[in-house]
C-alpha cells in the first residue's frame, strides 16, 4: 500500500468536518431519463435518454450500500442479447452482440477504527476497487483463430 | 453537507495508514487493452477489447491527477461520428450516430487542513462529481417532435 | 408545497393489468427516488420497489415475482406503478412515497401520496 | 429478507402516559430504522428517522432509542391525537420491511 497524508485535526476541532466533504447528491449516471414507452423492451427508442435510444438498450439496477461510499451505484443490465437493427429500432440483428461494459470504480468502505489499546475510535475509510457494468455496447461477435 | 464520523487515531499511530487504504494500481476498464491494429481508425475489430470491437468504437485518454483520488480517470473518444456497419465493420453506416455516455463520477481532493490556530495539518479529503465519458454507444438519432 | 397527488380507484379482473400514476408537485423530481408501498386491508406496509427519476434506476421487492414495474415521465413529474397478472390478494391501497435522504444517516419516506385503491374481484 | 416484529399488536392508554412500543429486526440493522404514524383512514406519516432524530414538525413528547436489533418508540406524555397505528422500518437492505403496526387507542 501507498498512502496520503492523511488529516488527524487538533483536539476540538471535527474531524468528520474537516475530513470529508460529502454532499448528498446521488451519483447515477449524468443524462436524464424520460419515459421509455416499453420499459423492459428490447427496442432502440428515437427519444429519451442514451440507454434507451442505444442498439443495445439497458436499464439501470441500484445497487445500495450503506456503509460505502458512494452509496447509490447503478448497474446497467443488457435487454437483448444481441443488437438491434437501425433500420427498425425493433427487431435484432444477430450479426452484433450486446455486451456489457465492465469497469473497477473507486469505492470507499467505512470501518471500525482503533484507537491505541483496541478502543473504538469512530469510523475509518477504506478504498476498494467494486465491478460495476455501466452500459451495454454493441459489438462484432470475437471470431475464434 | 452532511458527514460520516472519521477516524483520528491516537498520537503516534499512523493516521495515514489508518484513515485510507488507498493502493497504488489505477482504475481503467476492467478489459486489458490488446493492440488495435488500427489504433484510431473508424472500424470494429473482430478481436480485442470491447472499445475496439464495439460499432461505435472509442479510444481512452487517460487523466491524472496526483491531487484527486483517484489519481488516474479514463476518459472515451468516439473514433467515429456515425456507427460501423456490422456487416463490414468498417463502412460507416448514417442511420445511428456515435454518441459519449458520461457519467458524474465520485472523486476526492486532497487540500491542505488547518489546525486551531490555521496552522497546517497535513491534508484531508473534499469529496466532488467529476464529468467522465464512458464509452461511446451507437444509437438511433433523435427525432425532433 | 410538496405534493404528491395519486390517480383514482381502480376495479380489476383477476389476471389483467393496473397502472397507477403519482404527479409530483413543490420539488425538484430528479433529485429524489420515488418509493411505492402498498397496504392491503388490515395488514402491514409492503414496500413494492422504488425509482430515481434522474436515469430510471430501480430496484424492485422480488417477492412480487417480477409483476411489477416502475417508471417515471420526468417532463410530466410524474411516477408509474404498472402491477400485472393480478389476484384477489392484491386488493389494497397503492401508496407512491418520496424518499429523502442525507449522505449516509438515513433514507426515509417523507411525503407520501394519498393512496390509490385497487380492487382486484 | 430482513424481519421486523413489533410489540404489543395493540394497546390500550390514557391521556398523559408514557407509552412505549418496541420493534425487533431479525438481525443487525445499526441505526438503519424509520418510525411511521398512521392515523384512521389516513396517509403514513414519517415521524422519526435514523432511530431517533425527529421528522420536522413531530412534536417532542415523541423520541425513538436502539441499536442493532432493538428499538424502541416512546410518547412521553400521551395526548388524544396520539391514536393511530405505529409502524417501524428498516432501510440497511433491500427490501425494505416494516413491522405489522402497533394500535395506539385511549382508554
Known amino acids: 500500500y501507498s498512502h496520503w497524508p492523511s488529516c488527524c485535526p487538533s483536539k476540538g476541532q471535527d474531524t468528520s468536518e474537516e475530513l470529508l466533504r460529502w454532499s448528498t447528491v446521488p451519483v447515477p449516471p449524468l443524462e436524464p431519463a424520460r419515459p421509455n414507452r416499453h420499459p423492459e423492451s428490447c427496442r432502440a427508442s428515437e427519444d429519451g435518454p442514451l440507454n434507451s435510444r442505444a442498439i443495445s438498450p439497458w436499464r439501470y439496477e441500484l445497487d445500495r450500500d450503506l456503509n460505502r461510499l458512494p452509496q447509490d451505484l447503478y448497474h446497467a443490465r443488457c435487454l437483448c442479447p444481441h443488437c438491434v437493427s437501425l433500420q427498425t429500432g425493433s427487431h435484432m440483428d444477430p450479426r452484433g452482440n450486446s455486451e456489457l461494459l465492465y469497469h473497477n470504480q473507486t469505492v470507499f468502505y467505512r470501518r471500525p477504527c482503533h484507537g491505541e489499546k483496541g478502543t473504538h475510535k469512530g469510523y475509518c475509510l477504506e478504498r476498494r476497487l467494486y465491478r460495476v457494468s455501466l452500459a451495454c455496447v454493441c459489438v462484432r461477435p470475437r471470431v475464434m483463430g | 453537507y452532511s458527514h460520516w464520523p472519521s477516524c483520528c487515531p491516537s498520537k503516534g499511530q499512523d493516521t495515514s495508514e489508518e484513515l485510507l487504504r488507498w493502493s497504488t494500481v489505477p482504475v481503467p476498464p476492467l478489459e486489458p487493452a490488446r493492440p488495435n491494429r488500427h489504433p484510431e481508425s473508424c472500424r470494429a475489430s473482430e478481436d480485442g477489447p470491447l472499445n475496439s470491437r464495439a460499432i461505435s468504437p472509442w479510444r481512452y485518454e487517460l487523466d491524472r491527477d496526483l491531487n484527486r483520488l483517484p489519481q488516474d480517470l479514463y476518459h472515451a473518444r468516439c473514433l467515429c461520428p456515425h456507427c460501423v456497419s456490422l456487416q463490414t465493420g468498417s463502412h460507416m453506416d448514417p442511420r445511428g450516430n456515435s454518441e459519449l455516455l458520461y457519467h458524474n463520477q465520485t472523486v476526492f481532493y486532497r487540500r491542505p487542513c488547518h489546525g486551531e490556530k490555521g496552522t497546517h495539518k497535513g491534508y484531508c479529503l473534499e469529496r466532488r462529481l467529476y464529468r467522465v465519458s464512458l464509452a461511446c454507444v451507437c444509437v438511433r438519432p433523435r427525432v425532433m417532435g | 408545497e410538496v405534493q404528491l397527488v395519486e390517480s383514482g380507484a381502480e376495479v380489476k379482473k383477476p389476471g389483467a393489468s393496473v397502472k397507477v400514476s403519482c404527479k409530483a408537485s413543490g420539488y425538484s423530481f430528479s433529485g429524489y427516488t420515488m418509493n411505492w408501498v402498498r397496504q392491503a386491508p388490515g395488514q402491514r406496509l409492503e414496500w413494492m420497489g422504488l425509482?430515481?427519476?434522474?436515469?430510471?434506476?430501480?430496484s424492485y421487492n422480488q417477492n412480487f415475482k417480477g409483476r411489477v414495474t416502475l417508471t417515471v415521465d420526468t417532463s410530466a413529474s410524474t411516477a408509474y406503478l404498472e402491477l400485472n397478472s393480478l389476484r384477489s390478494e392484491d386488493t389494497g391501497v397503492y401508496y407512491c412515497?418520496?424518499?429523502?435522504?442525507?449522505?449516509?444517516?438515513?433514507?426515509?419516506?417523507?411525503?407520501w401520496g394519498q393512496g390509490t385503491l385497487v380492487t382486484v374481484s | 429478507d430482513i424481519q421486523m416484529t413489533q410489540s404489543p399488536s395493540s394497546l390500550s392508554a390514557s391521556v398523559g402516559d408514557r407509552v412505549t412500543i418496541t420493534c425487533s429486526a431479525s438481525q443487525g440493522i445499526s441505526n438503519y430504522l424509520n418510525w411511521y404514524q398512521q392515523k384512521p383512514g389516513k396517509v403514513p406519516k414519517l415521524l422519526i428517522y435514523?432511530?431517533?432524530s425527529l421528522h420536522s414538525g413531530v412534536p417532542s413528547r415523541f423520541s425513538g432509542s436502539g441499536s442493532g436489533t432493538d428499538f424502541t418508540l416512546t410518547i412521553s406524555s400521551l395526548q388524544p391525537e396520539d391514536v393511530a397505528t405505529y409502524y417501524c422500518?428498516?432501510?440497511?437492505?433491500?427490501?425494505?420491511?416494516f413491522g405489522q403496526g402497533t394500535k395506539l387507542e385511549i382508554k
Open positions: 435514523y432511530t431517533s
Open positions: 422500518q428498516q432501510y440497511l437492505a433491500f427490501p425494505y420491511t
Open positions: 412515497a418520496r424518499e429523502d435522504f442525507d449522505s449516509w444517516t438515513f433514507f426515509a419516506m417523507d411525503y
Open positions: 425509482i430515481n427519476p434522474y436515469n430510471g434506476g430501480t
